[in-house]
Each structure stands twice: as C-alpha cells, then as structure tokens.
C-alpha cells in the first residue's frame, strides 16, 4: 500500500492532524523534498550574517557576511574579518606580512615567496607583501653562448666589450649574492619557526580535517583566563 504522504510535494508537509492531507509549509519554514512529515524552520541571517537568498516554501534561506567579512564553514556558518592584501589575520587583528612572505588575497595567511633557485631560475621581479616573486630564466640561460643560434655580433671597439663583460659579471655576482642571502634568510626563518612556533600561531583553528584551515572566530576574554567567557580581540 502506497504511503499517502509520498504524494505531498516540496513546499508542503503531510499533516497527521488532518488525516495526512498535504498542508503548505507555514511561514518561515520550508520542505525541499516531497513526502516530508514536517517543514524545517528557515535559517535566519542575523548579526554578522546577511541574507543572500530569501527562504521560500521549497528552499532554505542562504546567508553571507556583512561587508568587511567573508564566509567560512559549510553554508557560511561563520564569518571572518577581511584583511588587506599584504596582511594576515592574527589574534590582534590584521598584521602586515613578514619580510619574505606575501598574501595576494583579503583572507588566508601570508605564504613564503617562491624560491626561484630551487628550480634553477633567477629572480626576475622581487616579491612584495602583496605579490610573489617572479622567476625568470636560469642564470645559465643568460650566459654568453648559451643560445645555440647566435646572430653575428657587430664589430665593436675592444673597450666596449670589456665594459659589457664587467657589467655582466657584476650583475651575475649580485644575483648570486642575492640568492645566497635569500637561501640563508629562509634557513633562519625555518629555524625560528621550529624553535619558536608560538610566534607563528594563528588566532583560531578548525578542529577537524587534515588540512587545518586557520581562522579567527574569537579570542578568550583576557580577564578570564582561568575560566569564564571567551571574547574576540580585533
């Protein structure tokens, strides 16, 4: 025997109090599938949340965040403060990226610049707080005779070619020094990160999943370290 409730479409519920008649969902509730015995209460977007999509009898409301915040969590169950590019969110609010790191978004953490030398390339454009370094061709590609087909060079005075050679050597030396400096810098940063992990701690952690996304929900109330409430420090 077929369940009479299975005939009730989305936007209705099977009303046991009225001989299993299909009744429309009451205001501020919905049923997204047929055959439901109750309608679910619509989500309400309050506080830092704002309504992105109104609730209807067949679909739930959808929330997003007020300006200056972005969604986190499934279905935007939490909002996190935006920062500027070149910054990351910490316990104390938005802080500039440390030297050697960058963030090109309004959310997330500062990431280390690409180490061009690891790919045997050279730094073409230096990194900033907002942008990663741009890696160029490897130093070998820049050296004379590296290209298999070279157009005949116009005849020049001996003095001129000496100037070009000196300039090239100076540039190569500078590049090598820069690469050595950057490599050393990253080694030191790695050592500091290992030795003093608390310096690099984010304000708020997601507790599930392998890749822990780091977010700022809130810090505890400073005056209640031993017990009491938690509070958000911007």
């Amino acid at each position: 025997l077929q369940d009479p409730c299975s005939n009730c479409p989305a936007g209705t519920f099977c009303d046991n109090n009225r001989n299993q008649i299909c009744s429309p969902c009451p205001p501020n509730s919905f049923s997204s599938a047929g055959g439901q015995r109750t309608c679910d209460i619509c989500r309400q977007c309050k506080g830092v949340f704002r309504t992105r999509k109104e609730c209807s009898s067949t679909s739930n409301a959808e929330c997003d965040c007020t300006p200056g915040f972005h969604c986190l969590g499934a279905g935007c169950s939490m909002c996190e403060q935006d920062c500027k590019q070149g910054q990351e969110l910490t316990k104390k609010g938005c802080k500039d990226c440390c030297f050697g790191t960058f963030n090109d978004q309004k959310r997330g953490i500062c990431r280390p610049w690409t180490n061009c030398s690891l790919d045997g390339k050279s730094v073409l454009v230096n990194g900033t707080k907002e942008r990663d370094v741009v890696c160029g061709p490897s130093p070998a590609d820049l050296s004379p005779g590296a290209s298999s087909v070279t157009p005949p060079a116009p005849a020049r005075e001996p003095g001129h070619s000496l100037q070009v050679l000196t300039l090239f050597l100076a540039l190569t030396s500078a590049l090598l020094l820069a690469l050595i400096f950057i490599t050393l810098l990253f080694s030191v940063l790695k050592w500091i990160r290992k030795k003093f992990p608390h310096i690099f701690k984010q304000p708020f952690k997601k507790t599930t999943g392998a890749a822990q996304e780091e977010d700022a929900c809130s810090c505890r109330c400073p005056q209640e370290e031993e017990g009491g409430g938690g509070g958000y420090e911007l």
Epitope: R43, Q44, C79, S218, G228, G229, G231, Y232
Partner: antibody, heavy 118, light 107 residues
Framework: QVQLKQSGPGLVQPSQSLSITCTVS????????VHWVRQPPGKGLEWLGV???????DYNDAFISRLSITKDNSTSQVFFKMNGLQADDTAIYYC????????????WGQGTTLTVSS | DIVMTQSQKFMSTSVGDRVSVTCKAS??????VAWYQQRPGQSPKALIC???YRYSGVPDRFTGSGSGTDFTLTISNVQSEDLAEYFC?????????FGSGTKLEIK
C-alpha cells in the same frame, strides 16, 4: 580588556518587574550585539533576546510580551527589563556578548541571581 | 523551535581518557552550532563555533565535529579542570536554543 558587569536585585516579589544593567568595557556597543540568557537552578540555558549593534532587537517569542532590552552606547550600558515575574522566573540571568563571527556568545557577564518569592 | 537534545545527562571519565559529548538537533541546522563549557559556580565559556572551529585559547584537546543534525564535542586526554557541564547551541534560527547539558565527572 573585555568585561561585562551586571548589577541588579537578588530578590523580587511575584508580579513585580526585574531590571538588570549590563555595563561593558573593552569593546563598543556600536560594534557588538549583547544577548540575555537565563539559567534556572540546576537546569540548562535559555535564550531570552538580543540587542544588536544597530539598536535592533530580537526576542524569544515566549517572552516577547513582557521583555524589553534597550541600551545607551555612550555609557556602554545595556538594560534588561522583564515584567510580571513568577516563581518559575527564578534563575541566574546572564548578559553575553555576541561573537563577531557568528550568532554565539563569546564573553559572558558574571550573572545576576534572581529569586522570585513573596 | 529547534530542539537540541543531549541524551546523556552525566558522563564519567578518567584523567587521560577520551570522551565524546553528543548533541542532536530536531532538524538540519547545517554547521550553525556552538559548544560551551560551564565549570561549577562559573559563567559559561565558549569552546567551539561553526560546529568545528575552536575559539582561540581553547586547548586543542577539544574537538568539534558534525553537521546536519548530529554533533559531537570530543575531549581527548581529559584533564581534571575539564570537570564541567557542556552545552551545545544552535544559531540556525530563532529562538536560539541550547541542549540540556552533559555533566562530565572525573573518576
């Protein structure tokens, strides 16, 4: 430092009203909402209502007819008033700050213990 | 109203153990759930919001999980200071509602 300090009477007679003031420091009422939650003796927590940073209020339907929440941003005070008290309104009343990231309570006042008795 | 059910009123555990406090919503609330700890004689303290995001300063032995209707607060390596009552709360819709609480007893 973030603090919510409550002041109010400990004993109220039946049918009288309850007034509690929640004075906040370390944050602004123009940025954060403040909720009111109560806890009857030996029982769980019950949400009563909230006043948002823009001054709008939302109340639990079960209390809407006898509850009023107002605030004064300049003095950083939130005022809670509940009328027509009965014995079953005996509880600890808390003010709590709304988290900036969701609709939850990230910092709580110390609580005001209310006894409704003649 | 959305009813949050914490079926276990009391749970007994020993220091160093792992314990899971459960909470069931009467309808799908996505991940709009927070958890609180209330030590005896104190105000509640926020532990978790958005079902699985830990508040800063909360020890990482506290883990939140779940979505839809079933939610869990797991405390691994239980410490004596974890003796408290734990409440879940939904913020999907008004009225905001709490579970009835689960009291954690340390043997």
């Amino acid at each position: 430092q973030v603090q919510l300090k409550q002041s109010g009477p400990g004993l109220v007679q039946p049918s009288q009203s309850l007034s509690i003031t929640c004075t906040v420091s370390g944050f602004s009422l123009t940025t954060y909402g403040v909720h009111w939650v109560r806890q009857p003796p030996g029982k769980g927590l019950e949400w009563l209502g909230v006043i948002w940073s823009d001054g709008n209020t939302d109340y639990n339907d079960a209390f809407i007819s006898r509850l009023s929440i107002t605030k004064d941003n300049s003095t950083s005070q939130v005022f809670f008033k509940m009328n027509g008290l009965q014995a079953d309104d005996t509880a600890i009343y808390y003010c709590a700050r709304n988290s900036i990231t969701s609709v939850s309570f990230d910092c709580w006042g110390q609580g005001t213990t209310l006894t409704v008795s003649s | 109203d959305i009813v949050m059910t914490q079926s276990q009123k009391f749970m007994s555990t020993s220091v160093g153990d792992r314990v899971s406090v459960t909470c069931k919503a009467s309808q799908n609330v996505g991940t709009t759930v927070a958890w609180y700890q209330q030590r005896p004689g104190q105000s509640p303290k926020a532990l978790i919001c958005s079902a699985s995001y830990r508040y800063s300063g909360v020890p990482d032995r506290f883990t939140g999980s779940g979505s839809g209707t079933d939610f869990t607060l797991t405390i691994s390596n239980v410490q004596s200071e974890d003796l408290a009552e734990y409440f879940c709360q939904q913020y999907n819709s008004y009225p905001l509602t709490f579970g009835s609480g689960t009291k954690l007893e340390i043997k």
